[in-house]
């Protein structure tokens, strides 16, 4: 899917409002230092590409993330703010139905969600990164919003 068409600000707001809380709940009981971040992203569309892949593509060691609450909310957010996204997700839905029904949270799933948290942190630029910052604000920075 081509994430260059998404409304990044709206996705940011949805993440901060709901998805982040569900990811943190999933990770409760683990420390942020328990896992090394090995997956990264280099710009906002690329971050969404990696987030989509880690959230919805089942892996042999962690097949059930797509059924989690944060994944459902992620899917809803992308469908809402990325034009045409929901039409591309038929195959992903089939994979979700085939995913294991057990609710066992494996260490590998925890590691994968830790990676997801890291990717989301990279995606979030304009809201979190400016809080308490003494840097310049974006008031006169037209480029920041010019493709929405």
């Amino acid at each position: 899917y081509d994430f260059t068409n998404c409304d990044f600000q709206k996705i940011e707001a949805d993440y901060l409002r709901t998805i982040s809380k569900d990811l943190i709940t999933y990770m409760s009981g683990t420390k942020s230092t328990d896992f090394n971040n090995t997956v990264s992203c280099s710009n906002r569309p690329h971050c969404l590409t990696e987030i989509q892949s880690l959230t919805f593509n089942p892996t042999p060691r962690c097949a059930s993330l797509a059924k989690e609450m944060f994944a459902r909310k992620t899917k809803a957010t992308l469908a809402l703010w990325c034009p045409g996204y929901s039409e591309t997700q038929i195959n992903a839905t089939q994979a979700m139905k085939k995913a294991r029904k057990s609710k066992v949270t494996t260490n590998k799933c925890l590691e994968q969600v830790s990676q997801l948290l890291g990717l989301w942190r990279r995606f979030i630029r304009t809201l979190l990164k400016q809080q308490g910052s003494s840097d310049y604000k974006d008031d006169d920075d037209k480029h920041h919003h010019h493709h929405h």
């Epitope: 260059t4 710009n43 840097d135 604000k137």
Partner: antibody, heavy 117, light 107 residues
Framework: EVQLVQSGAEVKKPGASVKVSCKAS????????MHWVKQAPGQGLEWMGM????????TLIQKFKDKVTLTVDKSTSTAYMELSSLRSEDTAVYYC??????????WGQGTTVTVSS | DIQMTQSPSSLSASVGDRVTITCRAS??????LAWYQQKPGKSPQLLVY???TLAEGVPSRFSGSVSGTQFTLTISSLQPEDFATYYC?????????FGGGTKVEIK
């Protein structure tokens, strides 16, 4: 007004090091990734790597991993690129450029590094 | 790594001509592509991003399009200030790569 102002031209001897600065103003420094691009004389543009000023995470392409160090100073909104063990093939113009969504909307004016014995 | 093959490497044209520059990606990069113009001794300037969105302040004679893995920059009517070198650049993950450049010269 958004500006990326780079340090002046440098002439260095082989084996030496050089540190190029890129001072950002007019926007929130930590919001945008900062990238570095090399342009050898008469050649095209070559992507070297990037740094996320918010946490200093860097990515460098393989050929520059032992050559380049990227750093930032958030207090002065400045990005730095250090080239070590300089050789003649490091002679080039080096640009900093910022990005949020993958395209470079602002570039520095470029810093010429000349390596000559 | 994704390779960007840009063609032609140079072309001669006259003021008023329609000029087309192409860039082919070695794999699918969706719309993760930008075009830049560079004049001698100057920094590159953004022309087009996300394959077909015109950057702020860029004249409407410039346009970008995409078909599969082939990207096109078109100048509908070449102006004297358009004689320069043009580069494409993908940003579909790292490493980012540029095309080899197209030098547009006066015929």
């Amino acid at each position: 007004e958004v500006q990326l102002v780079q340090s002046g031209a440098e002439v260095k001897k082989p084996g030496a090091s050089v540190k190029v600065s890129c001072k950002a103003s007019g926007y929130t420094f930590t919001t945008y990734w900062m990238h570095w691009v090399k342009q050898a004389p008469g050649q095209g543009l070559e992507w070297m790597g990037m740094i996320d000023p918010s946490d200093s995470e860097t990515t460098l392409i393989q050929k520059f991993k032992d050559k380049v160090t990227l750093t930032v100073d958030k207090s002065t909104s400045t990005a730095y690129m250090e080239l070590s063990s300089l050789r003649s093939e490091d002679t080039a113009v080096y640009y900093c450029a910022r990005t949020l969504d993958g395209y470079y909307d602002y570039w520095g004016q470029g810093t010429t590094v000349t390596v000559s014995s | 790594d994704i390779q960007m093959t840009q063609s032609p490497s140079s072309l001669s044209a006259s003021v008023g001509d329609r000029v087309t520059i192409t860039c082919r990606a070695s794999e699918n990069i969706y719309s993760y592509l930008a075009w830049y113009q560079q004049k001698p001794g100057k920094s590159p300037q953004l022309l087009v991003y996300f394959a077909k969105t015109l950057a702020e302040g860029v004249p409407s004679r410039f346009s970008g399009s995409v078909s599969g893995t082939q990207f096109t920059l078109t100048i509908s009517s070449l102006q004297p200030e358009d004689f320069a070198t043009y580069y494409c650049q993908h940003h579909y993950g790292t490493p980012w790569t540029f095309g080899g450049g197209t030098k547009v010269e006066i015929k």
